[in-house]
């Protein structure tokens, strides 16, 4: 058993049918010695008396808010949560496996630049009685500071018969140098509590591996005289690290017809302009990627050919 | 990225072209190592990230773009002295900091070159003959060093009398390649920045 926060405790259980469970001793936080009784949740049934209560915690029915009283007055509370260990592996019932970029990906994180700011998000089908708490650091043995905000509900989607909820959090490394070469990964830890179930999820990454630039901005077309060709130009996104000559991007320019089946023409360039043939009803899209370290491509910025 | 790329002319700055070749070569070598050594811990998540140049050179600090010198988190400076003549500088007026930067890059390359050559000698003794260092990568390191053209003491190749532990050598190769790729990215950024300025 360990303390998650004041008066909230997590009991770790080896979870299998007929498991013996864990013996837990609760102590009433009071100078009183006599006349103390214990109850669980809203029930008035007295579970025991005395300054300490010994219980065998086996299932969720044994978890909840234990309260010690004296003469009708509440003395203190202890909330017991359960953390299930199923055949050596902690349960992952609360969050959805996003399966990207690999199986067992519960937390996904992205950064728009090298400033040390990043966003993480996760999915769940649970709509109520759910709380999250996020902590982060650079490295784990001698951790350096990363400050995270509160997790917020950022999107709701309908998936088949189920509703899916997306939560996200923004974090900022306290003293980040955009040019630094990372040798210790960022660690992100999310505590999730659903009713009386506790779970924790972690992700470990280097900022350089989660970079996804914003799409190029100010995408414009300039027709070339007496030609079907156009000059496409764009700019680095505002959110990208500066100076741009140091944090350089490379670009992919795509000409896509109305039909998805039509052949796509693609050009790769390090410049912020390109000359392409603009077909009728086609659109031109440009996306960006770090020129030197191949992390994710940005989303596409698009303009119609007409 | 095995894709058609419209690359800009490296122009006045001869080192830019060599640094781009270096990044390409080390990335290819790392990819080959990850595929060949699939049963070894060779991914970024599995290895310890070690920097053999730590406390010996200070490339990131010495090559910091002017715009980032206002960022206190970037000024984690370490006192290091360097030799300051190099042919990449020949065509332009240059500051002491730029010379310091390029000589730091040169020292990095020299250190990695020694490590890779020592390691290759061990890998050649492996009866499995599983993996060797790409000669192209070693050649590219050499070319960039020549383009930087700093006078520097030659570091003798380390020789070892004991029987090499091939498992450890292959894991060390992965660690070195990961670190060298990160340094090659920094070198490329620096060369691009210097070329633009």
């Amino acid at each position: 058993i360990w303390e998650l926060k004041k008066d909230v405790y997590v009991v770790e259980l080896d979870w299998y049918p007929d498991a013996p469970g864990e013996m837990v001793v609760l102590t009433c936080d009071t100078p009183e010695e006599d006349g103390i009784t214990w109850t669980l949740d809203q029930s008035s049934e007295v579970l025991g008396s005395g300054k300490t209560l010994t219980i065998q915690v086996k299932e969720f029915g044994d978890a909840g808010q234990y309260t010690c009283h004296k003469g009708g007055e509440v003395l203190s509370h202890s909330l017991l949560l359960l953390h299930k260990k199923e055949d050596g592996i902690w349960s992952t019932d609360i969050l959805k496996d996003q399966k990207e970029p690999k199986n067992k990906t519960f937390l996904r994180c992205e950064a728009k630049n090298y400033s040390g700011r990043f966003t993480c998000w996760w999915l769940t089908t649970i709509s109520t009685d759910l709380t999250f708490s996020v902590k982060s650091s650079r490295g784990s043995s001698d951790p350096q500071g990363v400050t995270c905000g509160a997790a917020t509900l950022s999107a709701e989607r309908v998936r088949g018969d189920n509703k899916e909820y997306e939560y996200s959090v923004e974090c900022q490394e306290d003293s980040a140098c955009p040019a630094a070469e990372e040798s210790l990964p960022i660690e992100v830890m999310v505590d999730a509590v659903h009713k009386l179930k506790y779970e924790n999820y972690t992700s470990s990454f280097f900022i350089r591996d989660i970079i996804k630039p914003d799409p190029p901005k100010n995408l414009q077309l300039k027709p070339l005289k007496n030609s079907r060709q156009v000059e496409v130009s764009w700019e680095y996104p505002d959110t990208w690290s500066t100076p741009h000559s140091y944090f350089s991007l490379t670009f992919c320019v795509q000409v896509q017809g109305k039909s998805k089946r039509e052949k796509k023409d693609r050009v790769f360039t390090d410049k912020t302009s390109a000359t392409v043939i603009c077909r009728k009803n086609a659109s031109i899209s440009v996306r960006a990627q770090d020129r030197y370290y191949s992390s994710s491509w940005s989303e596409w910025a698009s303009v119609p050919c007409s | 990225r095995n894709l058609p790329v419209a690359t800009p002319d490296p122009g006045m700055f001869p080192c830019l072209h060599h640094s781009q070749n270096l990044l390409r070569a080390v990335s290819n070598m790392l990819q080959k190592a990850r595929q060949t050594l699939e049963f070894y811990p060779c991914t970024s998540e599995e290895i310890d990230h070690e920097d053999i140049t730590k406390d010996k050179t200070s490339t990131v600090e010495a090559c910091l773009p002017l715009e980032l010198t206002k960022n206190e988190s970037c000024l984690n400076s370490r006192e290091t002295s360097f030799i300051t003549n190099g042919s990449c500088l020949a065509s332009r007026k240059t500051s002491f900091m730029m010379a310091l930067c390029l000589s730091s890059i040169y020292e990095d390359l020299k250190m990695y070159q020694v490590e890779f050559k020592t390691m290759n000698a061990k890998l050649l003794m492996d009866p499995k003959r599983q993996i060797f260092l790409d000669q192209n990568m070693l050649a590219v390191i050499d070319e960039l060093m020549q383009a930087l053209n700093f006078n520097s003491e030659t570091v003798p190749q380390k020789s070892s009398l004991e029987e090499p532990d091939f498992y450890k050598t292959k894991i060390k190769l992965c660690i070195l390649l990961h670190a060298f790729r990160i340094r090659a990215v920094t070198i490329d950024r620096v060369m691009s920045y210097l070329n633009a300025s």
Epitope: D14, W15, Y16, P17, D18, A19, E59, F60, K85, E86, D87, G88, I89, D93, K102, N103, K104, T125 | F39, P41, E46
Partner: antibody
Framework: QVQLVQSGGGVVQPGRSLRLSCAAS????????MHWVRQAPGKGLEWVAF????????YYADSVKGRFTISRDNSKNTLYLQMKSLRAEDTAVYYC????????WGQGTMVTVSS | SYVLTQPPSVSGTPGQRVTISCSGG????????VKWYQQLPGTAPKLLIY???QRPSGVPDRFSGSKSGTSASLAITGVQAEDEADYYC????????????FGTGTKVTVLG
Amino acid sequence: QVQLVQSGGGVVQPGRSLRLSCAASGFTFSSYGMHWVRQAPGKGLEWVAFIRYDGSNKYYADSVKGRFTISRDNSKNTLYLQMKSLRAEDTAVYYCKTHGSHDNWGQGTMVTVSS
Amino acid sequence: SYVLTQPPSVSGTPGQRVTISCSGGRSNIGSNTVKWYQQLPGTAPKLLIYYNDQRPSGVPDRFSGSKSGTSASLAITGVQAEDEADYYCQSYDRGTHPALLFGTGTKVTVLG
């Protein structure tokens, strides 16, 4: 005390369907994940499928994906395996099993796919 | 498609020490715990070892398990006639959990 009693096995022609059941007693069935495991005659153990305690997630071996469906009825304390498009290579003893460090197995039920 | 490899058979005379190996990789045994099962002819498998080296109550102490790196082993110290059976190791793969990964199985024969 924990008991898993299996039923539903038998002889079936290739391409036909069969549903296996596993009735649980002696524990809170709705709190635990469950597996199906099979063993072809004279061969080793092969995992078939898994279902979460609440039925929210299901996982299958590649060899049965798209043909077999694992399900559970927590109100009846019963686990099911619906098997469609059966093949000769599905011939095996099928076991249900609880998920956890200490597990309990059903007695097994024989499924024979033969023309 | 077994990823955990066991020797097909091992044998010993009563009282001898018999060991069965189970060889895997970094993503399975290297990252997860190992179980061992005993299966007597015509019966369901019986759990012998869980969490690499733990014995459930009721399992004789002549059975012991161990794990090192990407391999595990089961030892029967002082093998007895009633130990003649098939033995299977089981683990998970970190990418496909909760799918069970079973070993290829080992037939233990007690001679004489």
